[in-house]
């Protein structure tokens, strides 16, 4: 038997993936555990194997279908269970009635590219990936720019309070290497959280023309 508190947190990417993390502060040695998803209004059910991500934390992804298929809706409720093998039986370690569109975390934005770069400014665009049509334009973004000699944590956050898949960065230093990241969040959902940050996009501003003020 396993003692101690556990935490079971899952997010829906709005299309065909539920990612779950289960933490258990009691010791679990060589125990096989899985997450089981059972929707209330559908015939399918899905299972994924929990794999360790730290000393007392396990994670897995429930793949519900093709990446862009709309496998759940705003009216679905999915019973999620953590099951761990005890001898020949499975023991329920955690359970929750999961409302997918109340627990959203989208995929990180993709296809970041420099549209136009100058000495002091840079226009960057991106795309959202595997986002449901339900959101229409009800998304917001956060962006950050890594300057030389600084860390990502020090970078100020730029907030875009609408579905705007581009940004014009101003007051940059000429002939300087920067990196840029963006993340996305739907406005919908009580427990919705930000997507992971996108892969960083590296760019360099143009050098100042000789003989001109910078």
């Amino acid at each position: 038997a396993v003692n101690g508190t556990s935490q079971f947190t899952c997010f829906y990417n709005s299309r065909a993936n539920i990612s779950c993390v289960w933490s258990q502060d009691g010791a679990l040695q060589d125990t096989s555990c899985q997450v089981h998803a059972w929707p209330d209004r559908r015939r399918w059910n899905q299972t994924c194997e929990l794999l360790p991500v730290s000393q007392a934390s396990w994670a897995c992804n429930l793949i519900l279908g093709a990446p862009d298929s709309q496998k759940l809706t705003t009216v679905d409720i999915v019973t999620l269970r953590v099951l761990c093998r005890e001898g020949v039986r499975w023991r329920v370690m955690a359970i929750q009635d999961f409302k997918p569109f109340e627990n959203l975390r989208l995929m990180a934005p993709i296809s970041l590219q420099v549209v136009h770069v100058e000495t002091h400014r840079c226009n960057i665009s991106w795309e959202i990936s595997q986002a449901s049509h339900y959101f229409e334009r009800h998304l917001e973004f956060e962006a950050r720019t890594l300057s030389p000699g600084h860390t990502w944590e020090e970078a100020p956050l730029l907030t875009l309070k609408q579905k705007q898949e581009w940004i014009c960065l101003e007051t940059l230093t000429p002939d300087t290497q920067y990196e840029f990241q963006v993340r996305v969040k739907p406005l919908q959902g009580e427990f919705t959280t930000w997507s992971p940050w996108s892969q960083p996009l590296a760019f360099r501003t143009k050098p100042a023309a000789l003989g001109k003020d910078t």
């Epitope: 209004r41 709309q70 496998k71």
Partner: antibody, heavy 117, light 111 residues
Framework: QVQLQQWGPGLVKPSETLSLTCTVS????????WSWIRQPPGKGLEWIGE???????NYNPSLKSRVTISVDTSKNQFSLKLSSVTAADTAVYYC???????????WGQGTLVTVSS | QSVLTQPPSVSGAPGQRVTISCTGG?????????VHWYQQLPGTVPKLLIY???NRPSGVPDRFSASKSGTSASLVITGLQAEDEGDYYC???????????FGGGTMLTVL
């Protein structure tokens, strides 16, 4: 293997209420959602509504004001009531396993309901 | 007028291949919802032929296959047989209507 058997009157007068019942055999009504679908003569299929064992219902918005679907788990049955019928409600009515978010299988044998005075 | 659009009729000779299309919009097929197909032979109850875009229930011959791309889906019947004659319907979910929707049906004639 789950089978559906439906019954009800084949003739209903205009402005009255159409009533049909479907019995689930070979399985439990508690296992899933159950739907009603209709097909006017020579025409296509139209989803009417659905229910589960606990009585949770969803209806087609175009019929919602006139439709009531109920369930009796002790008899493994679910029922359809459609009020204020007109000739346009003349159709073959089917019960089927499945929610409107899913596919429908199995199907009942169908009941032709004619609305006429 | 059906939410999903199918050709009213298609025909083919025995042994031939026929395709039935099903075109939807941005709130149903194009939104990523699964498409299901039914066969209704003359005077009979509709029968599930394909579920979740491409899957055949047990007992359905592999002459029947289906695919989905963008806002449309297709049912393909190869090696056409006389007993395939009947009506074929596609079905999906529509998030605007919050209801299951069907195509108008396609009558298949085997020449």
């Amino acid at each position: 293997q789950v089978q559906l058997q439906q019954w009800g009157p084949g003739l209903v007068k205009p402005s009255e209420t159409l009533s049909l019942t479907c019995t689930v055999s070979g399985g439990s009504i508690s296992s899933y959602y159950w739907s009603w679908i209709r097909q006017p003569p020579g025409k296509g299929l139209e989803w009417i509504g659905e229910i589960n064992h606990s009585g949770s219902t969803n209806y087609n918005p175009s019929l919602k004001s006139r439709v009531t679907i109920s369930v009796d788990t002790s008899k493994n049955q679910f029922s359809l009531k459609l009020s204020s019928v007109t000739a346009a409600d003349t159709a073959v009515y089917y019960c089927a396993g499945g929610s409107n978010l899913d596919w429908f299988d199995p199907w009942g044998q169908g009941t032709l309901v004619t609305v006429s005075s | 007028q059906s939410v999903l659009t199918q050709p009213p009729s298609v025909s083919g000779a025995p042994g031939q291949r026929v395709t039935i299309s099903c075109t939807g919009g941005s709130s149903n097929v194009g939104a990523g919802y699964d498409v299901h197909w039914y066969q209704q032979l003359p005077g009979t109850v509709p029968k599930l032929l394909i579920y979740d875009n491409t899957n055949r229930p047990s007992g359905v011959p592999d002459r029947f296959s289906a695919s989905k791309s963008g806002t449309s889906a297709s049912l393909v019947i190869t090696g056409l047989q006389a007993e395939d004659e009947g009506d074929y319907y596609c079905q999906s979910y529509d998030s605007s209507l919050r209801a299951s929707v069907f195509g108008g049906g396609t009558m298949l004639t085997v020449l």
